[in-house]
């Protein structure tokens, strides 16, 4: 193949090599950028900055090598458009630091930074941690800080992410109330802070106030939907990011729904109850208190993490005709009580038939001595005859 005279030449099916001395001062308009998976750059003294716009359109890039060049600064968001990047080699440049944000969100298998005049500071605490934890092939590089010794020996006692304290109301909140939350941020080198309110949707009207180090958030005219929703305060400094999530308890009255009985392993009368605090429940059968047993009992499904409603079943183990009737679920909490009723028919009464009807001659036995509401276990499936004298 003829030698490539351009600044950058194809390499394999989806690679590009840019090695001609001083030919590049930015990575704009690289040929065939959309399909590139590998980009190799060397000897580019004028390439000093790597920024967000430089790698736009390189969405398929897996391997990026910029070596023996003049790179001094890599923007924290430089790799936003290259989410698939797995190997990054920036060795033998003029980098004094590299933000933790630069590699956040990437799944880097390899990060090479040797041969840079790194300056030991808290901003490289994340890299020191990678070295400690054996990530990205960093330990093998024995990284040095320029004139300061090994990165591994950098004191880090004062290198912490921000500390957050979120003040929430110390009592429950009612529907329609306004709630003031305050996020107090402490720490060195604070850069940014804010609230993440993605879960709130229509749960309240949101008003933000203040800034570092004290952020205010008013949730106005709150609804019951605010329960179990995370309100998150976040802050960043040169060491990293901290988040603290809180939830606001919004009280509201009990409510209840009952659904038609369904036959599963046991019979189930499905119900849903809601309310904050969680309501206490009581069952009535034909208007009288239903005492639960090992045959008839309430069972809750696993609750969803982000809602107050609880779903469950009144379980009935092999119910008979004596269990047919009206089931009522009573729910109560401090702010309201509710009830719902449903008729359930599990089995026809075999002893209620018209003398004109054909006489059944064979069926499974039922223990007629049972007077309790508890279901009866079938002990023997053998059919037997019945003689009925009709007067």
């Amino acid at each position: 193949a003829a030698p490539c005279p351009d600044a950058c030449c194809p390499h394999g099916s989806s690679g590009l090599r840019c090695t001609r001395d001083g030919a590049l001062d930015s990575l704009h308009h690289l040929p065939g950028a959309e399909n590139l998976t590998e980009l190799y750059i060397e000897n580019q003294q004028h390439l000093q900055h790597l920024e967000l716009r430089d790698l736009r359109g390189l969405g398929e890039l897996r391997n990026l090598t910029i070596v023996k060049s003049g790179l001094r600064f890599v923007a924290p968001d430089a790799f936003h458009f290259t989410p698939r990047l797995s190997r990054l080699n920036l060795s033998f440049n003029a980098l004094e630091s590299l933000s933790w944000k630069t590699v956040q969100g990437l799944s880097l298998q390899e990060l090479v930074l040797s041969g840079n005049p790194l300056h030991c500071s808290c901003a490289l605490r994340w890299l020191q941690r990678w070295e400690e934890e054996g990530l990205g092939g960093v330990p093998e590089q024995k990284l040095q800080c320029h004139g300061q010794g090994p990165l591994a020996h950098m004191p880090n006692a004062s290198c912490g992410v921000p500390t957050l304290k979120v003040q929430v109301p110390n009592a429950s909140v009612d529907v329609g109330d306004d709630v003031l939350l305050r996020c107090q941020v402490e720490g060195r080198g604070l850069e940014q802070a804010g609230w993440i309110l993605t879960e709130l949707e229509q749960s309240a009207t949101v008003m933000k106030s203040g800034g570092l180090p004290s952020l205010g958030l008013t949730l106005a005219n709150v609804t019951s939907d605010l329960n179990r929703k995370n309100v998150t305060c976040w802050a960043e400094n040169d060491v990293g990011r901290a988040e603290v999530s809180v939830q606001v308890n919004v009280s509201f009255p009990a409510s209840v729904q009952l659904h038609t009985a369904v036959e599963m392993h046991h019979w189930c009368i499905p119900f849903s109850v809601d309310g904050q605090p969680a309501p206490s429940l009581r069952w009535l059968f034909n208007g009288s208190v239903l005492n639960e047993t090992s045959f008839i009992f309430t069972e809750f499904l696993e609750p969803a993490a982000n809602e107050t409603v609880r779903h469950g079943c009144l379980r009935l183990n092999q119910p008979t005709h004596v269990n047919n009737g009206n089931y009522t679920l009573l729910a109560a909490n401090p702010f309201g009580q509710a009830s719902a009723s449903i008729m359930a028919a599990f089995m026809d009464n075999p002893f209620e038939f018209n003398p004109e009807d054909p006489i059944p001659v064979s069926f499974s036995p039922v223990d007629t001595n049972s007077t309790s509401g508890d279901p009866v276990e079938k002990k023997d499936e053998t059919p037997f005859g019945v003689s009925v004298a009709v007067g």
Partner: antibody
């Protein structure tokens, strides 16, 4: 010092109306729930109405629901109880009471009560 | 609604004696609160959420219980303890009070 001062009580005929007021001082009124509780001539205590801190939620027992309305004006530190369609059985001393705040708990009691105002419903 | 039944209706004891006042709920409740009312005065919070002493209340007062049975105990009676005592539940709507126990000091 927390102070709650009720006013507006008096003698009213059955079917009539009254509006009770409760002036609050000594605490940040807008950050506490408030309630009205009455005491019958037989000395029984009955909860009558509850209102949330901002006034967005109100609760009543069935005995007064639809007849009584609780409200508040946080700018004036004042709680109100509008009583309509009054009956003889509404005769009582009416207390306004401040909700307590003991941790993040729904079951807080009423920690301060006013001296009460007497409502007599009689023809 | 949850009915609170207090017993005894009247209790007559001497100073220094121990007083035990009971409150029984018709259904299980999470907590019980207790109030004291002296003649001509408004009720005053004594015990909140079953066993916590309200501000300014002497330590001779204590509360206990769970479920449906709750107790207010005064370990050593003082003459100023003569009053009506009410239990109160806020666990289940509507919020209710007991009928009261009248404590007399001989």
């Amino acid at each position: 010092e927390v102070q709650l001062l009720e006013s507006g009580g008096g003698l009213v005929q059955p079917g009539g109306s009254l509006r009770l007021s409760c002036a609050a001082s000594g605490f940040t009124f807008s950050t506490y729930t408030m309630s009205w509780v009455r005491q019958t001539p037989g000395k029984r205590l009955e909860w009558v109405a509850y209102i949330s801190k901002g006034g967005g939620s109100t609760y009543y027992p069935d005995t007064v629901k639809g007849r009584f309305t609780i409200s508040r004006d946080n700018s004036k530190n004042t709680l109100y109880l509008q009583m309509n369609s009054l009956r003889a059985e509404d005769t009582a001393v009416y207390y306004c009471a401040k909700g307590a705040m003991y941790g993040n708990d729904f079951f807080y009691p009423m920690d301060y009560w006013g001296q009460g105002t007497t409502v007599t419903v009689s023809s | 609604q949850i009915v609170l039944t207090q017993s005894p209706a009247t209790l007559s004891l001497s100073p220094g004696e121990r007083a035990t006042l009971s409150c029984s709920a018709s259904s299980s409740v999470s907590y019980m609160h207790w109030y004291q009312q002296k003649p001509g005065q408004s009720p005053r919070l004594l015990i909140y959420t079953t066993s916590n002493l309200a501000s300014g209340i002497p330590s001779r007062f204590s509360g206990s219980g769970s479920g449906t049975d709750f107790t207010l105990t005064i370990s050593s009676l003082e003459p100023e303890d003569a009053a009506d005592y009410y239990c109160h539940q806020w666990s289940s709507y509507p919020w209710t009070f007991g009928g009261g126990t009248k404590l007399e000091i001989k």
